[in-house]
C-alpha cells in the first residue's frame, strides 16, 4: 500500500504527523489560543513534547526572526505552578530556561535567548507572536 503524507493548510509546516502554523502577529495568550482554535482540525497553541520537535520548530522560526518570543500552549491555569498543555498532551518533556518563574507569569513562551529551544514564563496578557499545532 502507498501511504500518503497528510497535507497541511497553506503555509503551515509538517513534522511527524502534525501541522504547525507560525503567526507573526500579536495576540495575548488567550486570544492566540482562540485564533488557533478558529482554524478547526483540533488546532491549539502548540505543545512541544520532545527535543526533536523543539529543534524542528526552533529551526523553522529562526528562518523568520531571532528576537521575538513566541507563545506556546503551556500554561498554569490554577496559578499554582501546575503547568499543563492546552491540547491535553502529557507534560513530560520540559525545557525551561534558568529564569525565575515567580510573579504573575502563568503562560509559557519560546525564548529567543536560546534560539527558541528553551521556554520562559510570562504574563498572559502580553501580546506576542504565537505557534499553533494540529494533527491533520
Amino acid at each position: 500500500d502507498i501511504i500518503m503524507r497528510p497535507s497541511c493548510a497553506p503555509g503551515w509546516f509538517y513534522h511527524k504527523s502534525n501541522c504547525y502554523g507560525y503567526f507573526r502577529k500579536l495576540r495575548n495568550w488567550s486570544d492566540a489560543e482562540l485564533e488557533c482554535q478558529s482554524y478547526g482540525n483540533g488546532a491549539h497553541l502548540a505543545s512541544i513534547l520532545s527535543l526533536k520537535e523543539a529543534s524542528t520548530i526552533a529551526e523553522y522560526i529562526s528562518g523568520y526572526q531571532r528576537s521575538q518570543p513566541i507563545w506556546i500552549g503551556l500554561h498554569d491555569p490554577q496559578k499554582r505552578q501546575q503547568w499543563q498543555w492546552i491540547d491535553g498532551a502529557m507534560y513530560l518533556y520540559r525545557s525551561w530556561s534558568g529564569k525565575s518563574m515567580g510573579g504573575n507569569k502563568h503562560c509559557a513562551e519560546m525564548s529567543s535567548n536560546n534560539n527558541f529551544l528553551t521556554w520562559s514564563s510570562n504574563e498572559c496578557n502580553k501580546r506576542q507572536h504565537f505557534l499553533c499545532k494540529y494533527r491533520p
Epitope: 497553506p10 503555509g11 502554523g21 507560525y22 503567526f23 507573526r24 502577529k25 500579536l26 528576537s67
Partner: antibody
Framework: EVQLVESGGGLVQPGGSLRLSCEAS????????MSWVRQAPGKGLEWVSS??????????YHADYVEGRFTISRDDAKNTLYLQMNSLRAEDTAVYYC???????????????WGRGTLVTVSS | FMLTQPHSVSESPGKTVTISCTRN????????VQWFQQRPGSSPTTVIY?????PSGVPDRFSGSIDSSSNSASLTISGLKTEDEADYYC?????????FGGGTKLTVL
C-alpha cells in the same frame, strides 16, 4: 498630535545624491520604528527602507531595488529620520513619504501615520 | 511575495463594496494586513490595521476581514459616500520584507 514633515527633495541628475529628512513631533520618536515609502507619479505605494528603534537594536532594512544605494538612519536627539540616496536613477523619481510604526513593540511592519511627502525628480 | 488587488471597482452611493487583496504565497493569516486610503493629491491614511481594527476617527462603515481558504483579505465599505472615492492599498509583511498591493481605485458613481 503626531506630525511628520519631510524635506530635502528636488531635482537631481542620474548618478547624483540627495539626503531626505523627516522631522517628527507629537510622539516619543526614539521608541518607534520608522520607514520610508515612495510613490512614483501615477503609480502605487512601494516600500523603500525601515529602521527599528534603538531599543530594538536600530536595525535597518532596505528593499532589494535600493540595497547598496540608499541608507536609512535616525537621530533620536533631533527627532529626525534620514534617507541618504546615492547613485540615483530615473526610476527613483517619486514622492517619498516617511511613516511611523503603529507599535513600539513589533517593529517595522505596519504604519499608522504618514508625512505629506517630498518629491524627488531624477532627470538630466 | 505579492499582494494582488483589482485595479478598479465602482458602486453607487449607499451601497456596499468589497475590495480584495490576495496573497500569492504562504498564508495571509500569519501576518497582519493593513488598509490605506489615499485621496487624490493627499498622503495615505490608515483605515484598517491588524486585519480588522479601525483607528479612532474611521467610521464603522469600514471593516476588514481575512479568509484563509482564499488566502485573501478584504476591505468592505458599506453605506458608500462620495467622499469614499479614493485609491485603497492593502499592505502586509514577512520577515524584513514589506509589500503593498497595487492599489484599487474606488469610484462612487
Amino acid at each position: 498630535e503626531v506630525q511628520l514633515v519631510e524635506s530635502g527633495g528636488g531635482l537631481v541628475q542620474p548618478g547624483g545624491s540627495l539626503r531626505l529628512s523627516c522631522e517628527a513631533s507629537g510622539f516619543s520618536f526614539s521608541s518607534y520604528g520608522m520607514s520610508w515609502v515612495r510613490q512614483a507619479p501615477g503609480k502605487g505605494l512601494e516600500w523603500v527602507s525601515s529602521i527599528t528603534s534603538r531599543g530594538r537594536g536600530g536595525s535597518t532594512y532596505h528593499a532589494d531595488y535600493v540595497e547598496g544605494r540608499f541608507t536609512i538612519s535616525r537621530d533620536d536627539a533631533k527627532n529626525t529620520l534620514y534617507l541618504q540616496m546615492n547613485s540615483l536613477r530615473a526610476e527613483d523619481t517619486a514622492v517619498y513619504y516617511c511613516a511611523k510604526d503603529w507599535s513600539a513593540y513589533d517593529s517595522v511592519h505596519l504604519f499608522d501615520y504618514w508625512g505629506r511627502g517630498t518629491l524627488v525628480t531624477v532627470s538630466s | 511575495f505579492m499582494l494582488t488587488q483589482p485595479h478598479s471597482v465602482s458602486e453607487s452611493p449607499g451601497k456596499t463594496v468589497t475590495i480584495s487583496c490576495t496573497r500569492n504565497t504562504d498564508n495571509i493569516a500569519f501576518n497582519y494586513v493593513q488598509w490605506f486610503q489615499q485621496r487624490p493629491g493627499s498622503s495615505p491614511t490608515t483605515v484598517i490595521y491588524e486585519d480588522n481594527q479601525r483607528p479612532s476617527g474611521v467610521p464603522d462603515r469600514f471593516s476588514g476581514s481575512i479568509d484563509s481558504s482564499s488566502n485573501s483579505a478584504s476591505l468592505t465599505i458599506s453605506g458608500l459616500k462620495t467622499e469614499d472615492e479614493a485609491d485603497y492599498y492593502c499592505q502586509s509583511y514577512d520577515g524584513n520584507n514589506l509589500v503593498f498591493g497595487g492599489g484599487t481605485k474606488l469610484t462612487v458613481l
